[in-house]
Interface confidence: medium
């Protein structure tokens, strides 16, 4: 029950996280104009990964897409790539995790298969979350660097003229959405990985294996112990045959026609 809850919660948390990553990637407010000490308050500039916008005090907004690839900074391209990779991995993870959910029955899928799928989706969510966090952090770092460069430039050149209209940019809402969404996806992934362990418990069943001679005397060979794990071929405690070997569960006290030397 706890495993199902952990898996289900992990799925929901990851779903919210990936929706957040998609939202952040599409948002225009990755960087917003710093209004502190800015005389041009009638217009407000902000940018996203795909276009830049300017809003008038009346509310009218004009947005223009970045119609060039070559003119964009390599770091911006890297951020775009990280966010897209995060979304793709997250989407695949969601698809895999739907089939891995314990509460959903698909044919005669064994718990071991569900465990493997849960682990796979969990890892995908973790990588997806890390991609989003990395992308947002790289962009934030670029902004911070540019902010202080702009601040330095404000008091140089054109005899202080630059200070009059210099626009500095600070963190936009999308950065915070991205950080939170990446964190949620990461947490969801960890929860899926934890649930995976519960789905496929490490069972170690030591079974004494008896060997029957064709005669009435019973010989026991040492070393016939078999450890069964949740991921092995003997997950259902199937009969283990080794020549004429039988598990202790089904040992017969007298020889039968099925006993071989």
């Amino acid at each position: 029950m706890a495993v199902t809850a952990c898996q289900g919660l992990g799925f929901v948390v990851s779903l919210i996280g990936i929706a957040g990553i998609i939202a952040a990637t599409c948002m225009d407010q990755w960087s917003t104009q710093d209004l502190y000490n800015n005389p041009v308050t009638a217009v407000f500039n902000y940018q996203g990964l795909w276009r830049s916008c300017v809003r008038e005090s009346s509310g009218f907004t004009e947005c223009r897409g970045y119609f060039t690839l070559l003119g964009l900074p390599a770091m911006l391209q890297a951020v775009r790539a990280l966010m897209i990779v995060g979304i793709v991995l997250g989407a695949i993870g969601l698809l895999v995790s739907i089939f891995a959910l314990k509460c959903i029955r698909i044919g005669s899928m064994e718990d071991s298969a569900k465990a493997n799928m849960t682990l796979t989706s969990g890892i995908m969510f973790i990588v997806s979350g890390l991609c989003a966090i990395a992308g947002v952090s790289v962009f934030a770092n670029m902004l911070v660097t540019n902010f202080w460069m702009s601040t330095a430039n404000m008091y140089t050149g054109m005899g202080g003229m630059v200070q009059t209209v210099q626009t500095r940019y600070t963190f936009g809402a999308a950065l915070f959405v991205g950080w939170v969404a990446g964190g949620l996806t990461l947490i969801g992934g960890v929860m899926m990985c934890i649930a995976c362990r519960g789905l496929a418990p490490e069972e170690t069943n030591y079974k004494a294996v008896s060997y029957h001679a064709s005669g009435h005397s019973v010989a026991y060979k040492p070393g016939g112990f078999k450890a069964s794990t949740g991921f092995g071929s003997n997950t259902k405690n199937k009969k283990i045959y080794d020549g004429g070997a039988r598990t202790e569960d089904e040992v017969q006290s007298y020889p039968s026609k099925h006993d071989y030397v």
Partner: nanobody, 119 residues
């Protein structure tokens, strides 16, 4: 080679009109918001007006509202400032400034044109 060249300045009587032009070259003009900034003798620089890259967003400083009109022609890579009902306090050097809509691109400045309002 990026260039911003202002023209149209001169001596005009109070109540008169002037039309300033700012011709741009060397960059994608339509991607840049264009500003007019002025500096009167012995005073600090003052922002006058701004027009967005597409021309849809326009704003003016309170001191010039209703008297000045900013416009741009992206086909000609030129911005204009129509100044009507000029006052002596409008006397200044007028500079045009091209400011990218994105923070990773440079801003560009013209050398300025002198406007003198005097009787």
């Amino acid at each position: 080679q990026v260039q911003l060249v202002e023209s149209g300045g001169g001596l005009v009587q109070p109540g008169g009109s002037l039309r300033l032009s700012c011709a741009a070259s060397g960059f994608t003009f339509s991607n840049y918001a264009m500003y007019w900034v002025r500096q009167a003798p012995g005073k600090g620089p003052e922002w006058v007006s701004v027009i967005s890259g597409g021309g849809g967003v326009i704003s003016y400083a309170d001191s010039v509202k209703g008297r000045f009109t900013i416009s741009r022609d992206n086909a000609k890579n030129t911005m204009y400032l129509q100044m009507n009902s000029l006052k002596p306090e409008d006397t200044a050097v007028y500079y045009c400034n091209a400011q990218s809509a994105v923070w990773w691109e440079n801003d560009y400045w013209g050398q300025g044109t002198q406007v003198t309002v005097s009787s």
